[in-house]
């Protein structure tokens, strides 16, 4: 059977299959039976990232420093600008429209994964044998002190928030 539709990079207009404009260009005029689709490159700070028939290019995203944003990758005529967050902040969404400070892991919790510009701190509870006595965005759970290696004995048991307290061994005669 003959094609009843246009080819992949074409669109139907006035009974003609016209070529779409390639990424980075916008549509100025549709083709006719005897003229070609007319496309023009997007201007400075504009882009189109697909084969299209758009008459206007999209504006590049603005990375607003007042929202804690900075440019991670400058946009081109075919790609949008990619924003990320300043040091100590991370994006609130996948599209990274604003930033919030990284959260700290409370005592009893340690950092499992340090935050990046696009992801928050991931905390984990300190397991038995480990503790964290600070609120921190960087510190992992630390192991309890090993009293034995210091030739000492445990005088006070450790918790997930406190280290063990070591003391001298009782010498009995």
């Amino acid at each position: 059977e003959p094609p009843t539709a246009c080819r992949e990079k074409q669109y139907l207009i006035n009974s003609q299959c016209c070529s779409l404009c390639q990424p980075g260009q916008k549509l100025v005029s549709d083709c006719t039976e005897f003229t070609e689709t007319e496309c023009l490159p997007c201007g400075e700070s504009e882009f189109l990232d697909t084969w299209n028939r758009e008459t206007r290019c999209h504006q590049h995203k603005y990375c607003d420093p007042n929202l804690g944003l900075r440019v991670q990758q400058k946009g081109t005529s075919e790609t949008d600008t990619i924003c990320t967050c300043e040091e100590g902040l991370h994006c609130t969404s996948e599209s990274c429209e604003s930033c919030v400070p990284h959260r700290s892991c409370l005592p009893g919790f340690g950092v499992k994964q340090i935050a990046t510009g696009v992801s928050d701190t991931i905390c984990e509870p300190c397991p038995v044998g480990f503790f964290s006595n600070v609120s921190s965005a960087f510190e992992k759970c630390r192991p309890w002190t090993s009293c034995e290696t210091k030739d000492l004995v445990v005088q006070q048991a450790g918790t997930n928030k406190t280290d063990v307290v070591c003391g001298p061994q009782d010498r009995q005669r």
Epitope: R7, K9, L20, E33
Partner: antibody, heavy 121, light 107 residues
Framework: QVQLVQSGAEVKKPGASVKVSCKAS????????MHWVRQAPGQGLEWMGW????????NFAQQFQGRVTMTRDTSISTAYMEVSRLRSDDTAVFYC??????????????WGQGTLVTVSS | DIQMTQSPSSLSASVGDILTITCRAS??????LNWYQQKPGKAPNLLIS???RLRSGVPSRFSGSGSGTDFTLTISSLQPVDFTTFYC?????????FGQGTKVEIK
């Protein structure tokens, strides 16, 4: 304006290969399928097949399958047609032609000037 | 494959004559039928698409008709530039096929 400019005439020995180029200008190359047509001396037109310049996909007439390769380089808007294991009866003019689709029909609206390939020992 | 049979394969005519070339498809191709003119040493040139649509810039002495399996190209008043070869082509299904051509010579 749309132009399809083909490479120059070639003389080849039997068993050799030949690669004909077709450089497109004046339109979006990836937007239209390119076809190849063969015409032996004093003979009629014979459709060989098409290439989708965007994906590189091809479709051949059965008698050209296996011995004919169609490729493209989108960076320079050029389609290529290669015939391997040439025989003397492959002597012909090869044309590239652009496909145009409307809702009433499909046709070739622009043709290259043709490339004569002579196969002779 | 769809066979396209053109007739006659050659003919002699005079300037001013009315000329009719026929093309028969081996199966129904609706109106997916084109006519091309080819001058010696040149690439073919589209005259008519979709059986009857005259291409812009082509003289009005050319006309096409037909649908299904039987098609006709008519030249109402032959001019000196028309003494060339004409081909029909079906684009209903691949492989796209051409008629064997009709060579028009001066009587």
């Amino acid at each position: 304006q749309v132009q399809l400019v083909q490479s120059g005439a070639e003389v080849k020995k039997p068993g050799a290969s030949v690669k004909v180029s077709c450089k497109a200008s004046g339109y979006t190359f990836a937007g239209y399928y390119m076809h190849w047509v063969r015409q032996a001396p004093g003979q009629g037109l014979e459709w060989m097949g098409w290439i989708n310049p965007d994906s590189g996909g091809t479709n051949f007439a059965q008698q050209f399958q296996g011995r004919v390769t169609m490729t493209r380089d989108t960076s320079i808007s050029t389609a290529y047609m290669e015939v391997s294991r040439l025989r003397s009866d492959d002597t012909a003019v090869f044309y590239c032609a652009r496909e145009k689709i409307t809702m009433t029909g499909i046709y070739f609206d622009y043709w290259g000037q043709g490339t004569l390939v002579t196969v002779s020992s | 494959d769809i066979q396209m049979t053109q007739s006659p394969s050659s003919l002699s005519a005079s300037v001013g004559d009315i000329l009719t070339i026929t093309c028969r498809a081996s199966q129904n191709i609706t109106t997916y039928l084109n006519w091309y003119q080819q001058k010696p040493g040149k690439a073919p040139n589209l005259l008519i698409s979709a059986a009857s649509r005259l291409r812009s810039g082509v003289p009005s002495r050319f006309s096409g008709s037909g649908s299904g399996t039987d098609f006709t190209l008519t030249i109402s008043s032959l001019q000196p530039v028309d003494f060339t070869t004409f081909y029909c082509q079906q684009t209903f299904t691949t492989p796209w096929t051409f008629g064997q051509g009709t060579k028009v010579e001066i009587k």
